[in-house]
């Protein structure tokens, strides 16, 4: 267990041209506050996924009124650190989002209004117990300077806050095999007593009495290798003798999510979906109201009408969720027609159209035949962004410029002989067959399988295919 601490040093215009206008004015005084969201690992999914490591909100900064005509200075900041407690091990790599919010204090109907001024995000490696790390991030024309660190809460120590320390029992030294706890030299590393029998190679514990498995191992004592063989258990294989897993307790067993949160398993752990009014890794943070700025991504917060609707976020286009925390995958609605590629740019949707199509949604079929001629009496046919010529008899090729051999495809069935003719082809049928392509057998009694032979033609005569 421990605490991630964030110290904001300054928020103001970044270097270079195009200084931003002050967010506050004499008519509309305002004050800033900050929100930090932490996720374990180097996750890419910034605003959408929950703040699995935790989140925190700063106090409000001092009220600021712009001096007329003056450029936007560094804005007055809230006092104190933003602190995000974490209960489990510090992951070492983490992703962060820091949002700068403006609270307008004018005479709005219904109290103050909030708007998102800037959001910065990043991925970092950080060992717990280390010194403050300094950072500068830019969001548009704004610049945010801050420092951060992760520190363990006693008795935890170490770069992941997983080792435990205890005061020395003997004044001079620690017990056998136990080191002093730097920097607390008057304390000794405490032996962490895992569940009896927990595999020393494949298991570990962060709390006394537990046995957590390294990847690839399972079972209550982490002694069973995870087999890739097909077994029936929902969490994996089913019996130790076959190398299959005995399903151990799942991360959602006993529902670790407080305050009515619903638990879903993730590849490494679990994730709580919190009801409105609660957030945090286990939905343990409560009492959230609009004053806490719970609506992300520029969502508008209004107070709800009962305790389960403590606040309501009206989300801007492209976002959803009770806190506007989820980006809508607008491409999943397949808005691009005619095979266009959908790109969700956040502020807008773009369709990249296939050749021959245009328009915001690729809805316009371009005239593929415009300016294209088909030779020798061929006609142009549009289709799928590429023109095609339907050629007159005796011609072929892309533009109907090639003289075709109508007999090349062996069109006469049942051994009929093909003759090229100025208007197409003629099939001379073998005895016993008739039809334009010699496709119909002549019945033994002399009657044809056709309803009637055309006048002037006897079965067996060559039939010209027009």
């Amino acid at each position: 267990a421990g605490v991630f601490e964030l110290q904001i040093h300054s928020f103001g215009p970044g270097p270079g041209p195009g200084a931003p206008r002050s967010p506050c004015s004499a008519r509309l005084p305002c004050r800033l506050f900050f929100r930090v969201c932490l996720k374990p690992g180097l996750s890419e999914e910034a605003a959408e996924s929950p703040c699995a490591l935790g989140a925190a909100l700063s106090a409000r900064g001092p009220v600021y009124t712009e001096q007329p005509g003056a450029p936007a200075p560094d804005l007055p900041l809230p006092d104190g650190l933003l602190q995000v407690p974490f209960r489990d091990a510090w992951p070492g790599t983490f992703s962060f989002i820091i949002e700068t919010w403006r609270e307008e204090l004018g005479d709005q109907i219904g109290g103050p209004a909030w708007s998102l001024l800037a959001r910065v995000a990043g991925r970092r490696r950080l060992a717990a117990g280390g010194p403050w790390a300094r950072d500068i991030q830019r969001a548009g024309a704004w610049e945010l300077r801050f420092s951060y660190r992760a520190r363990c809460e006693p008795p935890a120590v170490g770069t992941a806050c997983t080792r435990l320390c205890r005061p020395r029992s003997a004044p001079s030294r620690c017990g056998p095999g136990l080191r002093p706890c730097a920097p607390l030299e008057d304390e000794c590393e405490a032996p962490l007593v895992c569940r009896a029998g927990c595999s020393p190679e494949h298991g570990f514990c962060e709390q006394p009495g537990e046995c957590r498995c390294l990847e690839g191992w399972t079972g209550p004592l982490c002694t069973v290798p995870v087999s890739t063989s097909s077994c029936l258990s929902p969490r994996g294989p089913s019996s130790a003798t076959t190398g299959c897993l005995v399903p151990g307790p799942g991360p959602c067993d006993g529902n670790p999510c407080a305050n009515g949160g619903s638990c879903s398993e993730t590849p490494r752990s679990f994730e709580c979906t919190c009801p409105r009014g609660f957030y945090g890794l286990r939905c343990e943070v409560s009492g959230v109201t609009c004053a806490d700025g719970p609506c992300f991504n520029g969502g508008l917060c209004v107070g709800g009408a009962d305790p389960d609707s403590a606040y309501i976020c009206h989300c801007p286009p492209g976002f959803q969720g009770s806190n506007c925390e989820k980006r809508v995958d607008r491409c999943s609605l397949q808005p691009c027609r005619n095979g266009g590629l959908c790109l969700d740019l956040g502020h807008a949707l773009r369709c990249r159209c296939r050749a021959g199509f245009a328009g915001p949604r690729c809805e316009h079929d371009l005239d593929d035949c415009a300016g294209r001629a088909c030779a020798n009496g061929g006609t142009c046919v549009e289709g799928g962004g590429a023109h095609r010529c339907s050629c007159a008899l005796g011609f072929g090729g892309r533009d109907c410029r090639e003289r075709a051999d109508p007999c090349a495809a062996r069109p006469c069935a049942h051994g009929g002989r093909c003759y090229a003719h100025f208007s197409g082809l003629v099939c001379a049928c073998a005895p016993g067959y008739m039809g334009a392509r010699c496709e119909f057998p002549v019945h033994p009694d002399g009657a044809s399988a056709l309803p009637a032979a055309p006048p002037g033609l006897r079965p067996g005569d060559p039939q010209r295919y027009l």
Epitope: N259, G260, S262, A291, G304, A305, D308, S309
Partner: antibody
Framework: EVQLVETGGGLVQPKGSLKLSCAVS????????MNWVRQAPGKGLEWVAR??????????YYADSVKDRFTISRDDSQSMLYLQMNNLKIEDTAMYYC????????WGQGTLVTVSA | QAVVTQESALTTSPGETVTLTCRSS?????????HNWIQEKPDHLFTGLIG???NRAPGVPARFSGSLIGDKAALTITGAQTEDEAIYFC?????????FGGGTKLTVL
């Protein structure tokens, strides 16, 4: 438009039972807590019972005047809210409303329950 | 159990501004009481006017507004109309229990 339609009211004798239903449409019923509120003839409003959503384990709450006699329940699959009323008393005579609170209050048209000997 | 108190009756004139209040026996009304205002017109016609202190329901005229004034919840009608004559109930949440005031009969003469 959100619609709440109550049914099941009627005339019943003291100590009798009655089950009220409320059909809900045009909003995601599963997400919200639901309530029953009543108004006795010539009187003000009285909150009767509340049931929260699945993520809050369908927790239920009752006014002292109906505790242990009334049971609120819901069927999320059908978007239905129920009030099972047992051991009815004359003072339970009232118009019963299915009520849902979100950004403001949504009311049904009510169903009349009359308890009389 | 908490008791919620409202003025039993108020009279105003068309065009005037009138404020109805709602007091809690447990102390100051706060945003955590998610206070609501409900209008009752004849024939049991109830309309949710204001929720969560100041959310006006769709279709409710802008002259109706909710607020917290001192330690009380308030409903202000700025420029009352004759059609605003009705009984107004305030409701306050105490955790998961809802308590209504006795209602204010507003007459617009």
């Amino acid at each position: 438009e959100v619609q709440l339609v109550e049914t099941g009211g009627g005339l019943v004798q003291p100590k009798g039972s009655l089950k009220l239903s409320c059909a809900v449409s045009a909003f995601t019923f599963t997400t919200y807590a639901m309530n029953w509120v009543r108004q006795a003839p010539g009187k003000g409003l009285e909150w009767v019972a509340r049931i929260r959503n699945k993520s809050n384990n369908y927790a239920t709450y009752y006014a002292d005047s109906v505790k242990d006699r009334f049971t609120i329940s819901r069927d999320d699959s059908q978007s239905m809210l129920y009030l099972q009323m047992n051991n009815l008393k004359i003072e339970d005579t009232a118009m019963y409303y299915c009520v849902f609170y979100y950004d403001y209050v949504y009311w049904g048209q009510g169903t009349l329950v009359t308890v009389s000997a | 159990q908490a008791v919620v108190t409202q003025e039993s009756a108020l009279t105003t004139s068309p065009g005037e501004t009138v404020t109805l209040t709602c007091r809690s026996s447990t102390g100051a009304v706060t945003t955590s009481n998610y206070h609501n205002w409900i209008q009752e017109k004849p024939d049991h016609l109830f309309t949710g006017l204001i929720g969560g202190t100041n959310n006006r329901a769709p279709g409710v005229p802008a002259r109706f507004s909710g607020s917290l004034i001192g330690d009380k919840a308030a409903l202000t009608i700025t420029g009352a109309q004759t059609e605003d004559e009705a009984i107004y109930f305030c409701g306050l949440w105490y955790s998961n229990h809802l308590v209504f005031g006795g209602g204010t009969k507003l007459t617009v003469l």
